[in-house]
């Protein structure tokens, strides 16, 4: 027989020879870091077929690291489900707790003994410091000094000294989250007031109000013979500007060769950026109709809008 087989877990006792005679036996021992558990054989014989009789290293078991219990409020999860050397132990904490120490320990061989690469971590309760104070506002539980996981606070704005109220910009409620960090930035309290939206040759049809504060929503329609350039719905944003900008109502010109068609009220097209106050001054561009299949409107090929007048 030629050289005997090699194994991961066991090694030949003595030096291997280039050739072995029929009937000759070789013995193995468990390698460093492995230990023998009977009764499986750890030897083989060169048989008359000039092959070695079957043998395996299943009798040699890896050294295992000491058992680690789950940390309080967490879990120790052995990778591959084993404590044997060469493998890892992963640690995770329950919701509301965070890890102090190493997230992964390695089962390592020191001499012939398997030991863990470090101390098991611990799981500490997630705690948050008080959330930020905000100008012109306050939050609930302002007297509490330590907040636990998922504890929530809600912000509100103070009464304003002037005629216009403070608006709360952002989410009013935040909670103590993972890593002892609040779930989002604190909101802000400020006066948000949009200007009165003026549309020439059109008018407001909903969202009427004395003043237009944060998130006020207004809708418009154009007079007969005019179409809406921009969005028919605008919202007062946190910068005290209308978003999208206040639209304009532009004149629809009838086809030059026919009498003017009957016109429906207004047609909304995609939003475009315009000045907040509709302006009748400045250059007057040529406009093409933005729509084609609305009742009473000329199709683009039937006539063009060459003026605002």
């Amino acid at each position: 027989c030629e050289e005997p087989p090699t194994f991961e877990a066991m090694e030949l006792i003595g030096k291997p020879k280039p050739y072995y005679e029929i009937g000759e036996r070789v013995d193995y021992k468990c390698k460093k870091g492995y230990f023998y558990i009977p009764p499986l054989a750890t030897h083989t014989i060169c048989d008359r077929n000039h092959t070695w009789l079957p043998v395996s290293d299943d009798a040699c078991y890896r050294e295992t690291c000491p058992y680690i219990r789950d940390p309080l409020n967490g879990q120790a999860v052995p990778a591959n489900g084993t404590y044997e050397f060469g493998y890892q132990m992963h640690f995770i904490c329950n919701e509301g707790y965070y890890l102090i120490g190493e997230e992964i320990l390695y089962c390592e061989l020191k001499g012939s003994v398997a030991i863990w690469s470090g101390k098991p971590p611990i799981c500490e309760k997630v705690l948050c410091t008080p959330p930020p104070k905000i100008k012109n506002g306050k939050h609930t539980f302002s007297e509490v000094e330590v907040f636990e996981y998922l504890d929530a606070v809600t912000y509100s704005c103070d009464p304003a000294p002037g005629p216009d109220p403070f608006s709360l910009i952002g989410e009013s409620t935040i909670y103590c989250g993972d890593n002892s960090v609040w779930s989002r930035a604190a909101p802000e309290c400020k006066v948000v007031k949009c200007r009165f939206p003026v549309v020439e040759n059109g008018k407001q049809i909903s969202g009427f109000g004395k003043k237009f504060y944060y998130k006020a929503t207004v809708m418009f329609e154009c007079d007969k013979g005019f179409y809406l350039d921009g969005s028919d719905t605008i919202v007062c944003d946190s910068n005290s500007t209308w978003d999208p900008p206040v639209p304009k109502c532009l004149k629809v010109l009838p086809p030059s060769s026919t009498k003017p068609p009957a016109l429906s009220h207004s047609v909304s097209t995609s939003s475009t950026t315009k000045s907040p106050a509709s302006s009748a001054s400045g250059p007057r561009p040529t406009y093409k109709p933005p729509v084609s299949n609305y009742p009473g409107y000329p199709k683009p090929e039937e006539g063009i809008l060459d003026s605002l007048d």
């Epitope: 549309v199 004395k210 106050a277």
Partner: antibody, heavy 118, light 107 residues
């Protein structure tokens, strides 16, 4: 307290251009929206137009082809120009501040009488 | 344009009277209506904006109401300084238009 003061010639000949200024004291013209309003003798009020802080203007269509409202920030003044005047344009002309971007007129000048006559 | 019609065009009343002036719009204007007071030889003064909101410094005897097309200005107890001409003004639609005025005279 912001004050508005209209000024200009009290007499304008027919077909000429009426030019008035509105001087702002106690504030900057760049932060005010200003309207011009007129009142013929013994009659009611008539809105002429407005100029907004962004420079945009809106005019009463009754005057559209002959009115211009502008601002001169260096002089802290607004101006009204009305061309091709007739006797029907004889009136007291007021400039009035649009309140905080909303179309109510909270602060008015004292008004200036313009007579159109040859 | 939206026409604003005031009634009556003139009215005689005594000090202490309760007075109501009406203003009618030719189409719905929501609450977009203001009231002004004008004394002879003077510029108008804003009394009420957005139908019922009192402008700063205006006495509480003045009040406004209405919605849509019909509006009223009420003076609960007339004072000597209240004798003047009153104008309504709409601002839902350009051009912003005024009523013809109501002249309030001493009886």
């Amino acid at each position: 307290q912001v004050q508005l003061q209209e000024s200009g010639p009290g007499l304008v000949k027919p077909s000429e251009t009426l030019s008035l200024t509105c001087t702002v004291s106690g504030g900057s013209v760049s932060s005010y929206d200003i309207s011009w309003i007129r009142q013929p003798p013994g009659k009611g009020l008539e809105w002429i137009g407005v100029i907004w802080t962004d420079g945009g203007t809106n005019y009463n269509s009754a005057f559209m082809s002959r009115v211009t409202i502008s601002v001169d920030t260096s002089k802290n003044q607004f101006s009204l120009k009305l061309s091709s005047v007739t006797a029907a344009d004889t009136a007291v002309y007021y400039c009035a501040r649009v309140y905080d971007g909303y179309p109510w007129f909270a602060y008015w000048g004292q008004g200036t009488l313009v007579t159109v006559s040859s | 344009d939206i026409q604003m019609t005031q009634s009556p065009s003139s009215l005689s009343a005594s000090v202490g009277d309760r007075v109501t002036i009406t203003c009618r719009a030719s189409q719905g204007i929501s609450n977009y209506l203001n009231w002004y007071q004008q004394k002879p030889g003077k510029a108008p003064k804003l009394l009420i904006y957005y139908t019922s909101s009192l402008h700063s410094g205006v006495p509480s005897r003045f009040s406004g109401s209405g919605s849509g097309t019909d509006f009223t200005l009420t003076i609960s107890s007339l004072q000597p300084e209240d004798f003047a001409t009153y104008y309504c003004q709409q601002y839902i639609k350009l051009p912003w238009t005024f009523g013809g005025g109501t002249k309030l005279e001493i009886k």
